[in-house]
């Protein structure tokens, strides 16, 4: 007898009531920037402190009648979803509310900025345990709001925000578009994206994951024991803020990068019906629904990786797209994707002392995406080894020659406009897993990493007949770090990682003759860290 | 409102020498940029967040804000500093006419200026 949303985020082998401890999230403070709230509601009484911060615009309309219960509605509900006694995710979390939205649910970028600054100053004056900031609001893209979020995140604060309810690309909104913020879309009881009137949840590469956001039962400001059902990406974000509080309470030392990777790792995978999203956004939108980890104990032994898509390069001939990992993450591989198939590959390059993934558009191409595989690899020392185009017919190859370095990813980049249409495919010599092989007219880049106990292996899956998609997955206990296509298949649109599966996409088979070039091989590099596993066992 | 006018007169006198000097001329080759919300109905013209370069100290932020007020007053414009940011981003929030944007973008330490805009509960 628990609400569907709490059941959904609870690991299947636990009964939700038993699983969620009464003090879950008790070491964490969650800041809520929203409307005013009814702090004496039974769900949140004694656990939400209303700060004296208020920065809101005047309500619109001369005849607007301020009714306390309406003014408090949005914020009270969200506070209840995060930490409510009965319908909350993190029932032990304490909260602080800042009023940045007026009685009509409207605020300003400047008011939100001042609110974020207030939180930072509070943190400096009185440092507490882990902080989560919930931003259940959205406005148009704002450079300054994103910058403020970035600064706060770099000060060790976890920011969680609503993706937005505009049935649009979340990258067009702030703070949803800020890379440092955990951006949450909304799904319903059927794990479908939430429709809200003619609109619905936002989507796209700026969304980190989805969470329950339709018919969410929570505290109603109508009365001190009332409940009401509300829907939206705010409700979804509140679930993730609650999950984050639970995780941080169990592991207070988690960094933002570690927390984000765990949220992704423990999410339900591939349950959302992607047909709801516009076709061009499907590949960019994560098919992840947030869930609590199956245990409140750490999962530090796992090698966590996530896929980060760049913005679209645009169609100009020399256009490039860049995908970046978070400061605490390692770029272990780089791939590219183009819907037209016209691209000039990708390369890993240093930028500001950190590796980035850059994809190159080709003449006549509609643009490319760069896809970075970003991983948590403590004490890693990674470098890129490059081999220039070879003249030999056997193609270009590069391997990790340094002692103790293992291959985590392969990239190839070429200057010629349409590689491979008139050249025979290059066959990869067997038994040489620690090297990247590419077309003789391409430069090949190997990502080589040294980290304690890191081991990697190459896994391939080739299909002789042309297919729109070829996949290869890493087995249990191994994590996908690299994803690429074997050279010589000219109709390949690109390669990218989806969770632990490497996906190689090809042009529509109907337009490709079933020649020898129809063969498509997906190459996955799967890694694991014995060092992390041992460290975890020693702790236990 | 009248009190503010009085303040501006004082500021103009106090800052005339600083403003006319070259002590804090903007760095060469760096142009501050202006940003505004792409969604027109959400724009809030008349209020601007002036973001200063990363290492700018609070005292410099306050000085830059005062300088803007003084230069605006000389041109017959009323401005109001609503908030001075420090702790997260250096800068200030100012209520002023859009006519002053060009002037504001040329101030020392300015990285970019963003017009305020609305955010909404989701």
């Amino acid at each position: 007898s628990i609400p569907w949303n709490l059941e959904r985020i609870t690991p299947p082998r636990y009964r939700a009531d038993e699983y969620q401890p009464p003090d879950g999230g008790s070491l964490v403070e969650v800041y809520l920037l929203d409307t005013s709230i009814q702090s004496d509601h039974r769900e949140i009484e004694g656990r939400v402190m209303v700060t004296d911060f208020e920065n809101v615009p005047e309500e619109d309309g001369t005849r607007f009648h301020r009714q306390a219960s309406k003014c408090d509605s949005h914020g009270t509900h969200l506070a209840g979803v995060v930490s409510g006694r009965d319908a909350g995710v993190a029932k032990g979390a304490s909260m602080r509310s800042l009023r940045v939205l007026n009685c009509q649910g409207k605020g300003t970028v400047s008011g939100t900025l001042i609110g974020l600054e207030f939180i930072r100053k509070s943190q400096l004056v009185q440092p507490v345990g882990p902080l989560v900031v919930l931003l259940p609001l959205a406005g148009g893209y704002s450079r300054v709001l994103n910058a403020a979020c970035q600064r706060l995140a770099r000060a060790g604060v976890v920011l969680v925000t609503a993706a937005g309810n505009f049935r649009d690309d979340a990258c067009l909104y702030s703070p949803a578009s800020a890379p440092e913020v955990i951006t949450v879309g909304a799904t319903n009881a059927q794990d479908q994206p939430v429709t809200l009137g003619t609109l619905g949840t936002n989507f796209g590469r700026c969304v980190d994951l989805f969470a329950p956001g339709e018919d969410i039962i929570g505290a109603s400001s109508d009365c001190s024991t009332c409940f009401v059902s509300q829907s939206g990406t705010s409700q979804a974000a509140a679930h993730v803020a609650g999950i984050a509080a639970m995780m941080l309470s169990a592991e207070p030392e988690l960094t933002l990068a570690e927390l984000r990777q765990r949220l992704i790792h423990f999410s339900a995978k591939d349950v959302i019906n992607e047909a709801w999203f516009p076709e061009d956004q499907r590949v960019l939108t994560p098919n992840l629904v947030a869930a609590l980890p199956p245990s409140t104990h750490g999962a530090g032994w796992q090698l966590f990786c996530r896929t980060v898509w760049s913005a679209h390069s645009g169609p100009t001939r020399m256009a490039t797209a860049v995908a970046r990992c978070a400061p605490d993450e390692e770029l272990l591989s780089c791939s590219s994707f183009s819907r037209s198939g016209k691209r000039r590959g990708e390369r890993m390059e240093a930028q500001g002392g950190k590796l980035v993934c850059r994809a190159h558009n080709a003449f006549g191409g509609e643009g490319v995406y760069a896809i970075a595989r970003c991983c948590l690899l403590p004490q890693a020392n990674c470098s890129v080894h490059t081999a220039p185009p070879a003249e030999a017919s056997m193609g270009t190859r590069v391997h990790c020659h340094q002692q103790g370095h293992v291959l985590t990813g392969c990239s190839s980049h070429w200057e010629v406009e349409d590689l491979g249409t008139h050249k025979p495919p290059v066959l990869r010599p067997r038994g040489q897993p620690n090297q990247c092989v590419g077309h003789r007219e391409a430069s090949i880049h190997a990502s080589c990493c040294h980290a304690p106990g890191l081991e990697c292996k190459v896994k391939e899956h080739g299909i002789p007949a042309p297919q729109e998609q070829v996949t290869v997955a890493c087995e249990e206990g191994w994590t996908l770090t690299g994803c690429s296509a074997l050279p010589g298949t000219s109709h390949v649109l690109g390669a990218y990682a989806v969770d632990n599966t490497c996906v190689v996409r090809s042009r529509d088979v109907s337009t490709t003759g079933s020649t020898s070039e129809g063969a498509v091989t997906a190459v996955a590099i799967c890694c694991r860290s014995r060092h992390l596993a041992q460290a975890s066992q020693e702790l236990q | 409102q009248e009190d503010e006018d009085g303040d501006y007169e004082e500021l103009v006198l106090a800052l005339r020498s600083e403003e006319d000097g070259l002590a804090e001329a903007p760095e060469h080759g760096t142009t501050a940029t202006f940003h505004r919300c792409a969604k027109d109905p959400w724009r809030l013209p008349g209020t601007y967040v002036v973001v200063l370069k990363e290492e700018t100290h609070l005292s410099q932020s306050e000085r830059t804000a005062r300088r803007l007020q003084a230069q605006a007053a000389r041109r017959g414009y009323l401005t109001k500093i609503l908030h001075v940011f420090h702790g997260l981003l250096p800068g200030f929030l100012v209520k002023m006419s859009g006519d002053l944007l060009e002037l504001a973008l040329k101030l020392p330490h300015v990285d970019y200026i963003e017009e305020d805009s609305s955010v909404f509960a989701q």
Epitope: I2, R85, I217, C223, S224, T225, C226, F227 | -
Partner: antibody
Framework: QLQLQESGPGLVKPSETLSLTCTVS??????????WTWIRQPPGKGLEWIGS???????YYNPSLKSRVTISVDTSKNQFSLKLSSVTAADTAVYYC??????????????????WGQGTLVTVSS | EIVLTQSPATLSLSPGERATLSCRAS??????LAWYQQKPGQAPRLLIY???NRATGIPARFSGSGSGTDFTLTISSLEPEDFAVYYC????????FGGGTKVEIK
């Protein structure tokens, strides 16, 4: 059919602590659908809500009594208890336990006090 | 705290007559008001909840109306078993009860 039964001493000395237990039968305390509540009625007077608890042990008290009240739950025994410290003659009353639908699961019924125990009279006297 | 004032304190009527009981709140309680019936030596029993909804098993002669600050409990035709004390209760803000109205046989 759910039934509630109050038990505890009928006489308590002033300044001591009043302790009562409510045993729930015909249903489980273990449910997020309900709060378990104490209400009292001084002789010939009206009703006063004392406080409520859910199966997780999360409490909610009448502000006027908060400093003296402790409500606890024992799900293994299907019981919840009331402790009222520093009692005076003004605390003499019939003490009732009742169930209240929390409102989290709307299908569980109206969000009011129903059913009630039959009540137990506690007299504070030396 | 929201104070509920019930009137009259006592209502003397004969069986078959119509009883009208009033409950006034010191501030709006919206429709978050219930009515209980208490007979001597018994616990209160829920009659009406959310101002106008009859609880399970309550006869149709009992009806509730009102919202905001003024509420009425009506017993259309008094039966012998209806002579009791009636309390109103709000849950808009915490829980408070009215002082009660005693319906006695005339």
């Amino acid at each position: 059919q759910l039934q509630l039964q109050e038990s505890g001493p009928g006489l308590v000395k002033p300044s001591e602590t009043l302790s009562l237990t409510c045993t729930v039968s015909g249903g489980s305390i273990w449910s997020s659908s309900y709060y378990w509540t104490w209400i009292r009625q001084p002789p010939g007077k009206g009703l006063e809500w004392i406080g409520s608890i859910n199966y997780r042990g999360s409490t909610y008290y009448n502000p006027s009594l908060k400093s003296r009240v402790t409500i606890s739950v024992d799900t293994s025994k299907n019981q919840f208890s009331l402790k009222l410290s520093s009692v005076t003659a003004a605390d003499t009353a019939v003490y009732y336990c009742a169930r209240e639908n929390s409102g989290v699961v709307p299908a569980a019924g109206p969000n009011w006090f129903d059913p009630w125990g039959q009540g137990t009279l506690v007299t504070v006297s030396s | 705290e929201i104070v509920l004032t019930q009137s009259p304190a006592t209502l003397s009527l004969s069986p078959g007559e119509r009883a009208t009981l009033s409950c006034r709140a010191s501030q709006s309680v919206s429709s978050y008001l219930a009515w209980y019936q208490q007979k001597p030596g018994q616990a209160p029993r829920l009659l009406i909840y959310d101002a106008s909804n009859r609880a399970t098993g309550i006869p149709a002669r009992f009806s509730g109306s009102g919202s905001g600050t003024d509420f009425t409990l009506t017993i259309s035709s008094l039966e012998p078993e209806d002579f009791a004390v009636y309390y109103c209760q709000q849950r808009r803000n915490w829980f408070t009860f009215g002082g009660g109205t005693k319906v006695e046989i005339k």
